[in-house]
């Protein structure tokens, strides 16, 4: 769920998600529309697709709580719990490391970006 994602992103990136990523650009945070603004925004768009796929699989993406271990900078998704819990962890792990990989191109001006400015084709999944 959201608590898992917030904790994981903070551990991996060192940034407080609520201050740095939710929202950011056109896809980080709730919802998403238009062309992603930068690599960080692309991470979130891909994560949205990951969640959309799990939703089509009947997973409760905001409610399911999963277990994982964070050690020496790495995330290990537990094989405990249901299939949905395990896949949700995999989606969140991917976005966390994607955000970390793109910290060097993070743009403060895209924090709280005005969503009506998010134009263009929304990328397909």
């Amino acid at each position: 769920g959201i608590l898992n994602l917030n904790k994981m992103v903070k551990q991996v990136t060192g940034k407080m998600p609520i201050l740095s990523y939710w929202p950011y650009g056109c896809h980080c945070g709730l919802g998403g529309r238009g062309q992603p603004k930068d690599a960080t925004d692309w991470c979130c768009q891909t994560h949205d697709c990951c969640y959309d796929h799990l939703k089509t699989q009947g997973c409760s993406i905001y409610k399911d709580y999963y277990r994982y271990n964070f050690s020496q900078g790495n995330i290990h998704c537990s094989d405990k719990g249901s299939w949905c819990e395990q896949q949700l962890c995999a989606c969140d792990k991917e976005v966390a490391f994607c955000l970390k990989r793109n910290l060097d191109t993070y743009q403060k001006r895209l924090r709280f970006y005005w969503r009506p400015h998010c134009r263009g084709q929304t990328p397909g999944c």
């Epitope: 699989q57 009947g58 997973c59 094989d79 405990k80 249901s82 299939w83 949905c84």
Partner: antibody, heavy 121, light 106 residues
Framework: QVTLKESGPGILQSSQTLSLTCSFS??????????VSWIRQPSGKGLEWLAH???????RYNPSLKSRLTISKDTSRNQVFLKITSVDTADTATYYC?????????????WGQGTLVTVSA | QIVLTQSPAIMSASPGEKVTISCSAS?????MYWYQQKPGSSPKPWIY???NLASGVPARFSGSGSGTSYSLTISSMEAEDAATYYC?????????FGAGTKLELK
């Protein structure tokens, strides 16, 4: 060789607390990834999953019974326990403990013989 | 929770006959698991991750399906196959079982 064996009171009165023990051999609950579930089956009816405990003491419960269930373990004695509070006649069933397979952690590969529990009004 | 509906509830088959037991999920699941149970015995693992046979299961058994529709098939019924078969999912919590299909020898 993996074996599990359940034990319980046999008969108890409505409103009492049911205490069950699963004694096992052939594996250790201190091994990473290991876990044991409790599953019950009323006579002539289907299976109902109740609870699961993992090697690291993480516990999962069936939401429909969660308020009445407590699962625990004694790793050194190779035992898993289940307590069900405020039982009534609907809790009459054969209770099984089961362990998932190494190769597929959602498949219960090993089952105990079951212990019949009868709740009288 | 995901409800698994098995059909038929009871069926009978003659030796050599092809048998198909169905398991329908109330919402999509990734895998299905099957168990065989005979009277007075504990359930035995039969099929895992939809189509893989558990150890010791005869090759005449097979499993298939996806989404909300899964099935267990016996290519040629034998006397020892008479039993109750249960499907199970752990796609999402809680883990649930179907009500069972009782297969009798005709």
């Amino acid at each position: 060789q993996v074996t599990l064996k359940e034990s319980g009171p046999g008969i108890l009165q409505s409103s009492q607390t049911l205490s069950l023990t699963c004694s096992f051999s052939g594996f250790s609950l201190s091994t990473s990834g290991m876990g044991v579930s409790w599953i019950r089956q009323p006579s002539g009816k289907g299976l109902e999953w109740l609870a699961h405990i993992y090697w690291d003491d993480d516990k999962r419960y069936n939401p429909s019974l969660k308020s009445r269930l407590t699962i625990s373990k004694d790793t050194s004695r190779n035992q898993v326990f289940l307590k069900i509070t405020s039982v009534d006649t609907a809790d009459t069933a054969t209770y099984y403990c089961a362990r998932p397979a190494y190769y597929s952690n959602h498949l219960f590969a090993y089952w105990g013989q079951g212990t019949l529990v009868t709740v009288s009004a | 929770q995901i409800v698994l509906t098995q059909s038929p509830a009871i069926m009978s088959a003659s030796p050599g006959e092809k048998v198909t037991i169905s398991c329908s999920a109330s919402s999509s699941v990734s895998y299905m698991y099957w168990y065989q149970q005979k009277p007075g015995s504990s359930p035995k693992p039969w099929i895992y991750r939809t189509s893989n046979l558990a150890s010791g299961v005869p090759a005449r058994f097979s499993g298939s399906g996806s989404g909300t529709s899964y099935s267990l098939t016996i290519s040629s019924m034998e006397a020892e196959d008479a039993a109750t078969y249960y499907c199970q999912q752990y796609h999402s919590s809680p883990l649930t079982f179907g009500a069972g299909t009782k297969l009798e020898l005709k």
